[in-house]
Interface confidence: low
């Protein structure tokens, strides 16, 4: 079967059930439903999934049976619209059910909530989890899929199956270990952190497709795959880009069965053709399907062919540049991006896209000029400042990170970003700035050649979190502007923002700075978040506070927490010393 060249099927649901198998079919339908109806109880979703599965089985037995010819959107949408409490739980989302496909599915997609009002997932004791795992493994794993999917409505579904497989493996191994906790907890921490990162990366892909269109996503994919597979010819890269775009369009559009099926086909194609793609794929291609797909997605860049010829010959010196550009603009720009990216694994994808955009803009201008060649002859000179800007920024920030360490580096970013966009909610500023700060430990350890792709492409993912959270409740025109004007210039746009002089400082509220003994029982991470929340609030009250003033207040605050957590009567200490701290802080900041 050629990749994505399928015969017409009488029953799409039967076709996908047969392709994916019952286990994956059920898991993917559960993910799809949980990503759409994020507030529904687990048991309700399981019931819906079982009903859909039984129906699919009847269609496998007889593809001509009643309703088997309906599209998956129709079948799944009809099923979601049977939920009795739709209006009470989801409000206007219930209006989607009055629409016909494809508008109904589009309506459901628009109501996906990136920040659903759901309780924080609390990890039970290890023995409790192991008992639950042994009592009913299937339900335990379904619950994992459900809880992740409803909190991350754009999580890449086939990748979530891979996470679930690792989750199961962790419990299978560790629940029979001598020290269950020592075995299991690090594995769960790793899965949690990797899962959050995977969710954020996929969210950017979906934002790219949904907000900026297929062309933007394809450009990103050409650049990234050309870096990863520099020996693959342009046609091969382009084919992979076309297929990858289809996969992600499907997943971002809620077509999870098609997405998972097509991702499996793409992995199969890549492995069958690895000789013409990359020498780094051999190990990946020996793995089972889910591991194989994950491995391919994360595979290291192949070695660049040595001494590739100068780009100038085809893209600057050739007299046919404008003719070729006019004949097939996207192909020509795609070739430019491919050729540039395969030569520059040391550049971030967003930088490569900025260079391609500059090249495109220059050709648009110059190919209409009297002497096109004279006009575009110096186009590569325009690239220099674009390359130097992220290089310098990364150098400065890595130096700062190395001086301060992660926590204090995050605090510096908290202050910086709160001053830029003080209207943004404190939890969002804390979450985004903490993640921005993680760029230090993630990327600064790398040699120069790997720093920029690591740092700037990671920052794109984090800033997209800010953009999607802000889109839900827009409060800052500056954030809206940076998020919507250009996908590839988001980071430079935020970097260029200065202190918002129009911001009216927040009224001082002592309650914001009142702390209790419960802070002493928090983990180090949660304690940091409390302190960082206070820091953001301080800046919102006093945007013109200097670094020194803020540092003094934060040092006093840290000492206050440490002192009271050691006290016999912690609560009294927090009450009395807290009042003193608030007064001293107000005085220090001139509030």
């Amino acid at each position: 079967r050629g990749v994505f060249r399928r015969d017409a099927h009488k029953s799409e649901v039967a076709h996908r059930f047969k392709d994916l198998g019952e286990e994956n079919f059920k898991a993917l339908v559960l993910i799809a439903f949980a990503q759409y109806l994020q507030q529904c109880p687990f048991e309700d979703h399981v019931k819906l999934v079982n009903e859909v599965t039984e129906f699919a089985k009847t269609c496998v037995a007889d593809e001509s049976a009643e309703n088997c010819d309906k599209s998956l959107h129709t079948l799944f949408g009809d099923k979601l619209c049977t939920v009795a409490t739709l209006r009470e739980t989801y409000g206007e989302m219930a209006d989607c059910c009055a629409k016909q496909e494809p508008e109904r599915n589009e309506c459901f997609l628009q109501h996906k909530d990136d920040n659903p009002n759901l309780p924080r997932l609390v990890r039970p004791e290890v023995d409790v989890m192991c008992t639950a795992f042994h009592d009913n493994e299937e339900t335990f794993l379904k619950k994992y899929l459900y809880e992740i999917a409803r909190r991350h409505p754009y999580f890449y579904a086939p990748e979530l199956l891979f996470f679930a497989k690792r989750y199961k493996a962790a419990f299978t191994e560790c629940c029979q270990a001598a020290d269950k906790a020592a075995c299991l907890l690090p594995k769960l921490d790793e899965l949690r952190d990797e899962g959050k990162a995977s969710s954020a990366k996929q969210r950017l892909k979906c934002a790219s497709l949904q907000k900026f269109g297929e062309r933007a996503f394809k450009a990103w994919a050409v650049a990234r795959l050309s870096q990863r597979f520099p020996k693959a010819e342009f046609a091969e890269v382009s084919k992979l880009v076309t297929d990858l775009t289809k996969v992600h369009t499907e997943c971002c559009h809620g077509d999870l069965l098609e997405c998972a099926d097509d991702r499996a086909d793409l992995a199969k194609y890549i492995c069958e053709n690895q000789d013409s793609i990359s020498s780094k794929l051999k190990e990946c291609c020996e793995k089972p399907l889910l591991e194989k797909s994950h491995c391919i997605a994360e595979v290291e860049n192949d070695e660049m062919p040595a001494d590739l010829p100068s780009l100038a010959a085809d893209f600057v010196e050739s007299k046919d540049v404008c003719k070729n550009y006019a004949e097939a603009k996207d192909v020509f720009l795609g070739m430019f991006l491919y050729e540039y990216a395969r030569r520059h694994p040391d550049y971030s994808v967003v930088l490569l896209l900025r260079l391609a955009k500059t090249y495109e803009t220059t050709l648009e201008k110059c190919c209409a000029a009297a002497d096109p060649h004279e006009c575009y002859a110096k186009v590569f000179d325009e690239f220099k400042p674009l390359v130097e800007e992220p290089q310098n920024l990364i150098k400065q920030n890595c130096e700062l990170f190395e001086q301060l360490g992660e926590y204090k580096f995050q605090n510096a970013l908290l202050v910086r970003y709160t001053k830029k966009v003080p209207q943004v909610s404190t939890p969002t500023l804390v979450e985004v700035s903490r993640n921005l700060g993680k760029v230090g430990s993630k990327c600064c350890k790398h040699p120069e050649a790997k720093r920029m792709p690591c740092a700037e492409d990671y920052l794109s993912v984090v800033l997209n979190q800010l953009c999607v959270l802000h889109e839900k409740t827009p409060v800052s025109d500056r954030v809206t502007k940076c998020c919507t004007e250009s996908l590839v210039n988001r980071r430079p746009c935020f970097s260029a923002l200065e202190v918002d002089e129009t911001y009216v400082p927040k009224e001082f509220n002592a309650e914001t700075f009142t702390f209790h003994a419960d802070i002493c029982t928090l983990s180090e991470k949660e304690r940091q978040i409390k302190k960082q929340t206070a820091l953001v609030e301080l800046v919102k009250h006093k945007p013109k506070a200097t670094k020194e003033q803020l540092k003094a207040v934060m040092d006093d605050f840290a000492a206050f927490v440490e002192k009271c957590c050691k006290a016999d009567d912690k609560e009294t200490c927090f009450a009395e010393e807290g009042k003193k701290l608030v007064a001293a802080s107000q005085a220090a900041l001139g509030l």
């Epitope: 046609a235 004949e327 070739m335």
Partner: antibody, heavy 119, light 111 residues
Amino acid sequence: EVQLVQSGAEVKKPGESLKISCKGSGYSFTSYWIGWVRQMPGKGLEWMGIIYPGDSDTRYSPSFEGQVTISADKSISTAYLQWSSLKASDTAAYYCARLHGVVSRGDYWGQGTLVTVSS
Amino acid sequence: QSALTQPASVSGSPGQSITISCSGISSLAGSYNLVSWYQQYPGKAPKLIIYEVTKRPSGVSNRFSGSKSGNTASLTISGLQADDEAEYSCSSYAGRNAVAVFGGGTQLTVL
């Protein structure tokens, strides 16, 4: 100056083995694919296969798979085409070409090696 | 049996224009313009004259031009000259095994 220089003409008997060569100079030999092309008397050109000397990644056109072996020695910038057992139908001119960018674009060619197989 | 189809021969008088067609270009090769044209004199090696459908390598006369429509590529030679008499072959990306294919070749005769 980029050059591809092929070994001289060969006259062989059916069943004999043969290895012809193509030496590249004037460019980084490991950076470009090398393709081999057959042209039987009075006939058109046929791509036989390609090799990337940098890592000896080799691919064959379906009709030549198993019939010939393509190899390269990057230490002496030379690509090879060999037969383990020649047939009369292997009589042809064989060309090597440097492939630039995509595999359908041969920008520099060897002068050709004429192979005659006759009993 | 070539995957690309060319007329066996074409002819034209000096100064005229002629066009040689090459049909059977795969959709993949077509969408990314992966078609080349070669000129070959008897007993000599082929010479690249057009690549990526329309591009001419440096040193190739601008009388040679390439184009494509659907799954057919074309080579046009304008202002025909006596020394254009040669065999012309198209070549294109063949798909998954990543080895190109040639057309059967077209003999151009300048009358």
